[in-house]
């Protein structure tokens, strides 16, 4: 058998007066009882109606009844003020049954043809109610053939009576320190047959305060206390209520951090309910007094549990807890009414004693030993031998606690040694040279380490020399014995320096010519600059104008003299620069391989010979006087030359330093 609803058999038909369409007889009484299935009603209308008209249809009539109720008593052909004829009206049973009674009296003044009616069963729309009648369903009504059902809006559930919608209003938990709660639908009437539970649950230490606001309207009874609908408030200490009626209950200070509110309604009534505004309080913490030179934020009348404040110091003051600095400070009020942290101090920023400046000094400008906010100090370098690098030396103690220069630098200024100072103003000779006097060549460095070589001091912790002079020690820098500040090669009175690292030009190939014959030695400590120890300057871009052919340079060293021995005293010689092509040609013939003289070299010496550098001078500086700055600079490095020093037609060959300025600057800045 097919599944699905079993539809009722159709109910429909025709009714007519006896003898219709002929006239009806006197003294007739005929009754029809029509029945429709449950959930259905009967519809009836007349296609013909012709009965004797009488006052209130006392004589002949058709009576329609449904249950105990008379729906209509009909007679005549057309309705009058006191009698009704059906006309085009349709009649409906109130339930599923309809009784039709036809009666004629003992006489008719003229013949009447009676009536013809048709009926049918139709579904009752239970969802349609007459004005003033209670709705079938609380919320939504759904009609269907033979019946109906109710459903509820979200937040409600259908009561077991299948018509009422009870509110789903339990289990709400309020955890904020203040808020509002109300009966469902407030301020519209609250739902029937509902039981609502609301919880306010705050952190321990808080106390909930309840205020009833706006209006209060809960169904009541004149004699019995809230028998229908009621509101109750429960804490861990006591119960308040029940409440009903139209009077706003008083404020309730629960002295509890947890509150349960219960609201119960019955099946009847039409009341707007209630609204509660709740707040909370707690034991206040002591009022925070800002420390001197600080302020509290936010400012409140009182601070209770979970409230917090921060301390902000004025510019130039810092948060300190004892000696320990804080970037920020926030205290939180605890449930016992105490702050979780003690108040810090706002102490004036103290930059502390300024760091010592190597080769310089510091002077307190604001006052002796004053190192606090806005204090001023002045750094300066030791005169004559040091100069301050791009800095005016003035530093101010700023709010961040650092000594800061006018350019915003927090690092110390740098005292750079003054370069190129010499006691000497005129020339002499080495190979065919003469003795140097104190302060003539204060950049001169004696390098011992297997062989005797020379170098020139750069800044206060670098030595410029020839690659071939230190090649063997490139992996053992500590083997180099570096001496300076002396004229006598064998004197015990000198300033000792040690090497930290040796940097040989990557383009230098040992035993394959002398191209790129340049090296730097980094000293493991800075040397103290004085009149006997002063660095040589590196050439400026404009230096080539002082190094043209025939310009005089000066070479110095302890190398071989004309007697064939290493010089005991530092010797020097003034020699002219030789035309590069002339020098190249001089070394084109055997035993020199072609291309011995490169663009990275310069030559100096006399065509007639007699003045030259020699073995033992290697790595030393060929220096020139910059007449604009009146400082000496290194133009060449003693590199190589003829087998016989000072030979006529041959020249001393020097590494051309100006070609290596980027290389030198990179090494020094990187290391």
């Amino acid at each position: 058998t097919p599944l699905g609803p079993k539809w009722p058999e159709p109910v429909f038909g025709r009714l007519a007066s006896p003898g219709f369409p002929g006239e009806y007889a006197n003294d007739q009484e005929r009754r029809w009882t029509l029945t429709a299935p449950p959930g259905y009603r009967l519809r009836l209308y007349f296609t013909h109606f012709d009965l004797e008209l009488s006052h209130l249809c006392e004589y002949d009539f058709v009576k329609l009844s449904s249950g105990a109720k008379v729906l209509a008593t009909l007679c005549g052909q057309e309705s009058t003020d006191t009698e009704r004829a059906p006309g085009k009206d349709t009649f409906y049973s109130l339930g599923s049954s309809l009784d039709i009674t036809f009666r004629s009296d003992y006489s008719n003044e003229k013949p009447f043809t009676g009536f013809e009616a048709f009926y049918a069963a139709e579904d009752i729309d239970e969802c349609q109610v007459a004005p003033g009648e209670a709705p079938t369903c609380d919320h939504h009504c759904h009609n269907h053939l033979g019946g109906f059902y109710c459903s509820c809006r979200a937040g409600y559930v259908l009561h077991r009576n299948k018509r009422t919608c009870s509110a789903l209003c339990s289990g709400q938990v309020f955890t904020q320190r203040s808020g509002e709660l109300s009966s469902p639908e407030y301020p519209r009437p609250y739902p029937k047959l509902s039981s609502c539970t609301y919880s306010i649950s705050l952190e321990e230490g808080f106390s909930v305060i309840l205020d009833f606001v706006e209006s209060f309207d809960v169904e009541t009874h004149p004699e019995t206390l809230c028998p229908y609908d009621f509101l109750k408030i429960q804490t861990d200490r006591e119960e308040h209520g029940p409440f009903c009626g139209k009077t706003l209950p008083h404020r309730i200070e629960t002295k509890s951090n947890t509150v349960t509110i219960t609201f119960v309604t019955d099946e009847s009534g039409d009341h707007t309910g209630w609204k509660i505004h709740y707040t909370s309080t707690a034991q206040p913490c002591p009022y925070p007094m800002a420390p001197p030179n600080g302020h509290v934020s936010p400012v409140q009348a009182k601070y209770i549990l979970k409230d917090s404040f921060s301390i902000f110091c004025e510019t130039g003051y810092e948060l300190l807890q004892g000696h320990l600095p804080l970037k920020s400070f926030t205290a939180v009020c605890q449930k016992d009414g105490s702050w979780d942290r003690p108040m810090p101090a706002c102490s004036i920023v103290d930059c502390g004693p300024p760091d010592d400046l190597p080769s310089g000094r510091v002077e307190y400008i604001t006052g002796p030993g004053v190192t606090t906010y806005k204090a001023v100090i002045q750094y300066s370098c030791e005169e004559t031998f040091y100069t301050m690098k791009v800095n005016d030396g003035k530093y101010v103690c700023e709010a961040d606690g650092f000594w800061t220069s006018s350019k915003g630098e927090k690092s110390l200024p740098v005292c750079e040694p003054v370069c190129g100072l010499s006691a000497r103003t005129t020339g002499g000779q080495i190979y065919g040279g003469q003795k140097a006097k104190p302060g003539d060549f204060p950049w001169q460095v004696l390098i011992l380490g297997g062989t005797t070589a020379a170098g020139a001091l750069l800044y206060d912790n670098w030595v410029l020399t020839a690659a071939h002079a230190v090649y063997e020690q490139k992996h053992d820098a500590s083997a180099l014995d570096i001496r300076m500040g002396t004229l006598k090669r064998l004197s015990p009175h000198y300033t000792q320096a040690w090497s930290e690292a040796v940097f040989i030009h990557e383009g230098y190939t040992h035993d394959a010519g002398f191209d790129n014959d340049i090296a730097l030695i980094k000293l493991n400590n800075k040397v103290v600059i004085n009149s006997n120890i002063t660095p040589i300057c590196l050439p400026r871009k404009e230096a080539e104008s002082f190094m043209r052919t025939d310009d005089i340079g000066t070479a110095s060293g302890w190398g071989l003299t004309q007697r064939g021995f290493l010089a005991r005293n530092l010797m020097y010689v003034d020699i002219p620069i030789v035309d590069h092509q002339k020098c190249t040609a001089a070394y084109e013939k055997p035993p020199y391989p072609r291309g011995s003289v490169t663009a990275n070299m310069l030559c100096a010496g006399l065509e007639s010979g007699g003045k030259d550098s020699c073995r033992g001078d290697s790595g030393g500086a060929l220096v020139f006087l910059d007449s604009e700055t009146e400082r000496w600079f290194v133009g060449g490095i003693v590199s190589w030359g003829s087998m016989n020093c000072g030979e006529a037609g041959q020249y001393g060959v020097y590494t051309k330093v100006i070609n290596y300025i980027p290389w030198i600057e990179n090494i020094i800045s990187d290391f």
Epitope: Q321, G322, H323, L324, P325, L326, K327, S328, G401
Partner: antibody
Framework: QVQLQESGPGLVKPSETLSLTCTVS?????????WNWIRQPPGKKLEWMGY???????SYNPSLKSRITISRDTSKNQFSLKLSSVTAADTAVYYC???????WGQGTLVTVSS | DIVMTQSPATLSVSPGERATLSCKAS??????VAWYQQKPGQSPRALIY???YRYSGIPARFSGSGSGTEFTLTISSLQSEDFAVYFC?????????FGGGTKVEIK
């Protein structure tokens, strides 16, 4: 969870420089507080050596001022201790800690011996 | 330097009893004092800061009091895990200094 971890050589020769690093996790050293180095020679009491603050400022124990440097590497969230010219008296367990000691490293023993 | 003097050097207490440890500063340090517990081979553990503020996670049996030059750490009812060395520490002035410690041992 804030954690501090000291690292560095356990043996240093006299006259050399002792170098230790404290790596901080769970909190940025630039966010707040002072970051301390504290040491404890065997059987002796704790000695505060110095701190570097959230801003990079330093404060040193005057007894060590000529030998101590505290620096930081904010990219690695580390701060470091350098103590120069060490002697046997510098043998101790070295701790790094935050502010007034709410968090400490586990400590590292440094022995100064040739 | 501010000297922090702890007394007694050793305190013998039975479990469940109260222990009172004293720390005296040679100068006024306000309330800038912390207390630490140290067990052998371990780093110190912070108990109290600012003389009387207990760190979170520290049992309520530990309490600190005092200000100025006299400070006290009280352990209301000693548990077996409380037997250790306790240090006080002032952070009021440079250099920060520590007390010599009080060893709390089982009686």
């Amino acid at each position: 969870q804030v954690q501090l971890q000291e690292s560095g050589p356990g043996l240093v020769k006299p006259s050399e420089t002792l170098s230790l690093t404290c790596t901080v996790s769970g909190y940025s050293i630039t966010s707040d507080y002072a970051w301390n180095w504290i040491r404890q020679p065997p059987g002796k009491k704790l000695e505060w050596m110095g701190y570097i603050s959230y801003s990079g400022r330093t404060s040193y124990n005057p007894s060590l001022k000529s030998r101590i440097t505290i620096s930081r590497d904010t990219s690695k969230n580390q701060f470091s201790l350098k103590l120069s010219s060490v002697t046997a008296a510098d043998t101790a367990v070295y701790y790094c800690s935050r502010h007034y000691g709410d968090y400490w490293g586990q400590g590292t023993l440094v022995t100064v011996s040739s | 330097d501010i000297v922090m003097t702890q007394s007694p050097a050793t305190l013998s207490v039975s479990p469940g009893e109260r222990a009172t440890l004293s720390c005296k500063a040679s100068q006024n340090v306000g309330t800038n004092v912390a207390w630490y517990q140290q067990k052998p081979g371990q780093s110190p553990r912070a108990l109290i800061y600012s003389a009387s503020y207990r760190y979170s996670g520290i049992p309520a049996r530990f309490s600190g009091s005092g200000s100025g030059t006299e400070f006290t750490l009280t352990i209301s009812s000693l548990q077996s895990e409380d037997f250790a060395v306790y240090f006080c520490h002032q952070y009021n002035a440079n250099p920060l200094t520590f007390g010599g410690g009080t060893k709390v041992e089982i009686k």
